[in-house]
């Protein structure tokens, strides 16, 4: 004997968040009177997704016309759909019954799976700033994605990195996904200028993967290297002595010149000339009036790089010596004058 | 009010496909939530329901023609259309092109068209 | 699928005769009956649906009644424009079927 048959053709629907869910379904008969319900999920724990006989769903709507006597299409369409959504789909056919319809025949039900894009990675580096030759890592993250399987990538400067670890969590089924991993990247001085780069690609994206960036310049600090000259000028009682601060980063730094021993003049850096590297040069000087002393100076530059504990270099300046025969004559690469007279 | 036409060639040779298509006038195939439907009469036997689309594209075929039937809707051109692969000379018959209307008896059909299958 | 059984397949009867065609279900398919008119060469039109009711335009000596398994068609005084073939078709189980038809003719 024929009976009526609930037919969900689709065992499986795969629909991209925001976009609308077609869940098919057919009874093959008109007979038992009564109707259809959408739930998702079975057992009693269920939940109601569409009552063709009453209720209010905002997000459904109905394929055919449902109030049609002959209606056997009971598809559904299911808007804007999120990865909250993701489950399996029953229709449900009642019998009409007093006081309450009775579940007569139900299908075999659709799986609805969300496609949902990651968000975009969000790369960070550490809290601390550190020096060439150290290892630092850098985190990235993103959220919120569906299907699970997704794959990251680390580049540095358009170099694909190997040292780093990736998690996927939840490790079992869930609505979405988020993916953290932390790669370890040894700084070079010439960093300034570089990035590493988060490399997230995913089926939603189709092949067009979704990218964050991390400048090492807000990571890495490159100390100071320091050179004191002597040089003569036109009077012959007068020395110029020039600190030469070179090849550093961040440009936060403050020069103290020392006579011995004792502070002279504290100076900020200010014009500042930029490597190519991204690194800063910087030149302080001091004009030194050689007869203004009996005993030999020892003029110390001491510099405090970026809140870290001060470098310095010294200088013996022999007031017993002419000063044109004292010092070497190295070119300043920077002009920038700083000057003070000692009398 | 509503008509019906059904086209295609009135000679197709065995293991080829028929194909068919019925063009629906004096007003919208997508309107009034109607289903459209097939139906074929052999030669002196009486009628055989081939399956039906709704304009939304939800289809159902007689399962004895299944494996073989796709019924297809333009909303665009207000057609729809029949498609019967691997044929034999079994399928040579008058096939008509009906509107299953409110009222659940097709109400509408077209005319009919003579489709014999022979080499 | 379910059978139409129609009888008689064949009836000759005289104009202003009551003619009554039957059609019988393999199972409960409640009224969801309809009865086509098919003259030669032509193709079928409507006359009753859900059993009982006239389809628009039909002229009022076709009646359809029954429910559940046994349906019957009448045609209370046949006029010489009746002379068709008359099919029954349920639409209570998919596929619909049709009844083998019944070929009115006049004596």
């Known amino acids: 004997e024929e009976e009526l048959q609930v037919i969900q053709p689709d065992k499986s629907v795969l629909v991209a968040a925001g976009e609308t869910a077609t869940l098919r379904c057919t009874a093959t008969s008109l007979i038992p009177v009564g109707p259809i319900q959408w739930f998702r999920g079975a057992g009693p724990g269920r939940e109601l997704i569409y009552n063709q006989k009453e209720g209010h769903f905002p997000r459904v709507t109905t394929v055919s016309e449902s109030t049609k006597r002959k209606n056997m299409d009971f598809s559904i369409r299911i808007g804007n759909i999120t990865p909250a959504d993701a489950g399996t789909y029953y229709c449900v056919k009642f019998r009409k019954g007093s006081p309450d319809d009775v579940e007569f025949k139900s299908g075999a039900g659709t799986e609805l799976s969300v496609r949902a894009k990651p968000s975009a990675p969000v790369v960070s580096g550490p809290a601390a700033r550190a020096t060439p030759q150290h290892t630092v890592s850098f985190t990235c993250e993103s959220h919120g994605f569906s299907p699970r399987d997704i794959t990251l990538k680390w580049f540095k400067n358009g170099n694909e990195l190997s040292d780093f670890q990736t998690n996927v969590d939840p490790v079992g089924e869930s609505v979405s996904y988020s993916i953290h991993s932390t790669a370890k990247v040894v700084l070079t001085r010439e960093d300034v200028h570089s990035q590493v780069i988060c490399e997230v690609a995913h089926v939603t994206l189709q092949g067009d993967p979704l990218r964050g960036t991390a400048n090492l310049s807000e990571t890495i600090r490159v100390p100071p290297t320091l050179e004191v000259t002597q040089q003569p000028v036109r009077a012959e009682n007068q020395v110029n002595v020039t600190c030469q601060v070179r090849k550093f980063y961040p440009q936060r730094l403050q020069l103290t010149w020392l006579e011995n021993g004792n502070v002279s003049r504290t100076e900020t850096a200010s014009t500042v000339t930029e490597n190519k590297d991204g690194t800063y040069n910087w030149m302080s000087w001091l004009l030194v009036n050689v007869s203004a002393h009996r005993d030999d100076v020892k003029l110390t530059c001491q510099v405090e790089h970026d809140g870290q504990p001060a470098v310095s270099k010294s200088h013996d300046l022999k007031v017993s010596a002419h000063p044109k025969e004292q010092g070497s004559n190295t070119a300043a690469e920077n002009t920038g004058s700083n000057e003070r007279n000692i009398y | 009010q509503v008509q019906l036409q059904e086209s295609g060639p009135g000679l197709v040779k065995p293991s080829q496909t028929l194909s068919l298509t019925c063009t629906v006038s004096?007003?919208?195939?997508?309107?009034?939530?109607?289903?459209w439907a097939w139906i074929r009469q052999h030669p002196g036997k009486g009628l055989e329901w081939i399956g039906y689309?709704?304009?939304?594209?939800?289809?159902y075929y007689n399962p004895s023609l299944k494996s073989r039937v796709t019924i297809s809707v333009d909303t665009s051109k207000n057609q729809f259309s029949l498609k019967l692969s691997s044929v034999t000379a079994a399928d040579t018959a008058v096939y008509y092109c009906?509107?299953?209307?409110?009222?659940?008896?097709?109400?509408?059909w077209g005319q009919g068209t003579t489709v014999t299958v022979s080499s | 699928d379910i059978q139409m059984t129609q009888s008689p397949s064949s009836l000759s009867a005289s104009v202003g005769d009551r003619v009554t065609i039957t059609c019988q279900a393999s199972?409960?398919?409640?009224?969801?009956l309809n009865w086509y008119q098919q003259k030669p060469g032509k193709a079928p039109k409507l006359l009753i649906y859900?059993?009982?009711n006239l389809a628009t335009g039909v002229p009022s000596r076709f009646s359809g009644s029954g429910s559940g398994t046994d349906f019957t068609f009448t045609i209370s005084s046949l006029q010489p424009e009746d002379i068709a073939t008359y099919y029954c078709?349920?639409?209570?189980?998919?596929?619909?079927?049709f009844g083998g038809g019944t070929k009115v003719e006049i004596k």
């Open positions: 009906a509107r299953e209307g409110y009222h659940s008896g097709m109400d509408v």
């Open positions: 004096g007003g919208s195939i997508s309107s009034g939530g109607d289903y």
């Open positions: 689309i709704y304009p939304s594209g939800f289809t």
């Open positions: 199972q409960d398919i409640s009224n969801y």
């Open positions: 859900d059993a009982s």
């Open positions: 078709q349920q639409f209570a189980y998919l596929p619909w079927t």
